[in-house]
C-alpha cells in the first residue's frame, strides 16, 4: 500500500529541522524514545507531538532563543514554524486526542528530532516497499 502523504510531509519537515542548528536546538526535551518498548506506533507519534508542543509553547518567546540579531530571530521563527507543522502532522498520523508523557530522561531537541527522523524513515521504507 502507498505511504501516507502526511508521512512524506513529516520526513520533509524533519529534514529541514535537522540540517541546521539554532540557538535552541541544544535545549532539552523529554526523551520518549528511551523506554518505548511497550508503546504502540500511534502512541509514539502522539507522545512525540506532545513533546514538541511543550517545547514550542515554552520557548516560542524565549529571549535566549530569539537571540540578539534579526538573523537569529528569523531562524528561531523558522524553527517554531517547522515544529508547529510537525506537531500538526504527527497528531494527524496518531489519530489520538491525548497521551501521557511521564519519562524522566531528557535529550536535546536536536537528538530528539534525529531519532524521530530515523523512525519515520523506517516507517516510510516499510510502506513504500
Amino acid at each position: 500500500h502507498k505511504c501516507d502523504i502526511t508521512l512524506q510531509e513529516i520526513i520533509k519537515t524533519l529534514n529541514s529541522l535537522t540540517e541546521q542548528k539554532t540557538l535552541c536546538t541544544e535545549l532539552t526535551v523529554t526523551d520518549i524514545f528511551a523506554a518505548s518498548k511497550n508503546t504502540t506506533e500511534k502512541e509514539t507519534f502522539c507522545r512525540a507531538a506532545t513533546v514538541l508542543r511543550q517545547f514550542y509553547s515554552h520557548h516560542e518567546k524565549d529571549t535566549r532563543c530569539l537571540g540578539a540579531t534579526a538573523q537569529q530571530f528569523h531562524r528561531h521563527k523558522q524553527l517554531i514554524r517547522f515544529l508547529k507543522r510537525l506537531d500538526r502532522n504527527l497528531w494527524g498520523l496518531a489519530g489520538l486526542n491525548s497521551c501521557p508523557v511521564k519519562e524522566a530522561n531528557q535529550s536535546t531537541l536536536e537528538n530528539f528530532l534525529e531519532r524521530l527522523k530515523t523512525i519515520m524513515r523506517e516507517k516510510y521504507s516499510k510502506c513504500s516497499s
Epitope: K12, E19, Q20, Q71, L79
Partner: antibody, heavy 123, light 106 residues
Framework: QLQLQESGPGLVKPSETLSLTCTVS??????????WGWIRKPPGKGLEWIGS???????DYNPSLKSRVTISVDTSKNQFSLKLSSVTAADTAVYYC???????????????WGQGTMVTVSS | DIQMTQSPSSLSASVGDRVTITCQAS??????LNWYQEKPGKAPKLLIY???NLETGVPSRFSGSGSGTDFTFTISSLQPEDIATYYC????????FGGGTKVEIK
C-alpha cells in the same frame, strides 16, 4: 522566476549619502521565509556584506558600517533600499542586492543576486 | 566578529587538475558555510551551501566539506570555464566573506 534589479546614481560626491534601490520581480518581498541583503565589492578587493532586512522590517548591519547604514523596505513597491551616509572614495564599489532564506529550510545562503551597479565616490 | 581566512589567495593549475581551497573560521560556525564563484563583470554565484551541499544546476566536479572551523572546497577536474575568484562565506553569526581565491589556468 525571481529577479532583482539595483538602481541609483552611479556617481556620488564625498560626504554625501549613497542611495540605492533594489526592485524585486517575480515574487513577493513580504514572505516570512526570506530576507534581503546588500553586498558590495570594491575594485580589486573582496566581497563585503553591508546589511540585511527581514519581512518584519528588522535589520542587521555590518558592525564596521553600522553607524552609516540604513536599509528599509517598501512592500507596496516590492522594493528595498540602501542608504550609506558620509561616503568616501573607499565606498566606491559594485553594489549588489540579494535574497537569502528559504521556505523549506531554517536558513539559506544569498542565492539570488542582482547584476550589480557600480557606484563611484568622487568630486 | 567572525573572521574567515581563505587560502591560497591565488593559484594556477592545468586543465584537468584537482584544485583545493581552504577556509578557516575564527570560531565554530557549525555548517553555516557557503562557497561562491565570481567571474569578472558578473554577480557571485552560489555553488555550495551549508559546507557540503551542491546548489541545483552546479556541476558535480565542485564539492565542499568540513564543519566547525575548517572547510575545504574542491574542483575535482579543473575546466577552462572555472577561471574565477572563489569566496567562502560564513552565515552562522551575521555574514563574513573570506578574502577570495583567484583561480587561473597554467
Amino acid at each position: 522566476q525571481l529577479q532583482l534589479q539595483e538602481s541609483g546614481p552611479g556617481l556620488v560626491k564625498p560626504s554625501e549619502t549613497l542611495s540605492l534601490t533594489c526592485t524585486v520581480s517575480g515574487g513577493s518581498i513580504s514572505s516570512e521565509s526570506y530576507y534581503w541583503g546588500w553586498i558590495r565589492k570594491p575594485p580589486g578587493k573582496g566581497l563585503e556584506w553591508i546589511g540585511s532586512i527581514y519581512y518584519s522590517g528588522s535589520t542587521d548591519y555590518n558592525p564596521s558600517l553600522k553607524s552609516r547604514v540604513t536599509i528599509s523596505v517598501d512592500t507596496s513597491k516590492n522594493q528595498f533600499s540602501l542608504k550609506l551616509s558620509s561616503v568616501t572614495a573607499a565606498d566606491t564599489a559594485v553594489y549588489y542586492c540579494a535574497r537569502g532564506g528559504a521556505s523549506d529550510r531554517i536558513d539559506h545562503a544569498f542565492e539570488i543576486w542582482g547584476q550589480g551597479t557600480m557606484v563611484t565616490v568622487s568630486s | 566578529d567572525i573572521q574567515m581566512t581563505q587560502s591560497p589567495s591565488s593559484l594556477s593549475a592545468s586543465v584537468g587538475d584537482r584544485v583545493t581551497i581552504t577556509c578557516q573560521a575564527s570560531q565554530d560556525i557549525s555548517n553555516y558555510l557557503n562557497w561562491y564563484q565570481e567571474k569578472p563583470g558578473k554577480a557571485p554565484k552560489l555553488l555550495i551551501y551549508d559546507a557540503s551541499n551542491l546548489e541545483t544546476g552546479v556541476p558535480s566536479r565542485f564539492s565542499g566539506s568540513g564543519s566547525g572551523t575548517d572547510f575545504t572546497f574542491t574542483i575535482s577536474s579543473l575546466q577552462p570555464e572555472d577561471i574565477a575568484t572563489y569566496y567562502c562565506q560564513q552565515y552562522y553569526d551575521l555574514y563574513t566573506f573570506g578574502g577570495g581565491t583567484k583561480v587561473e589556468i597554467k
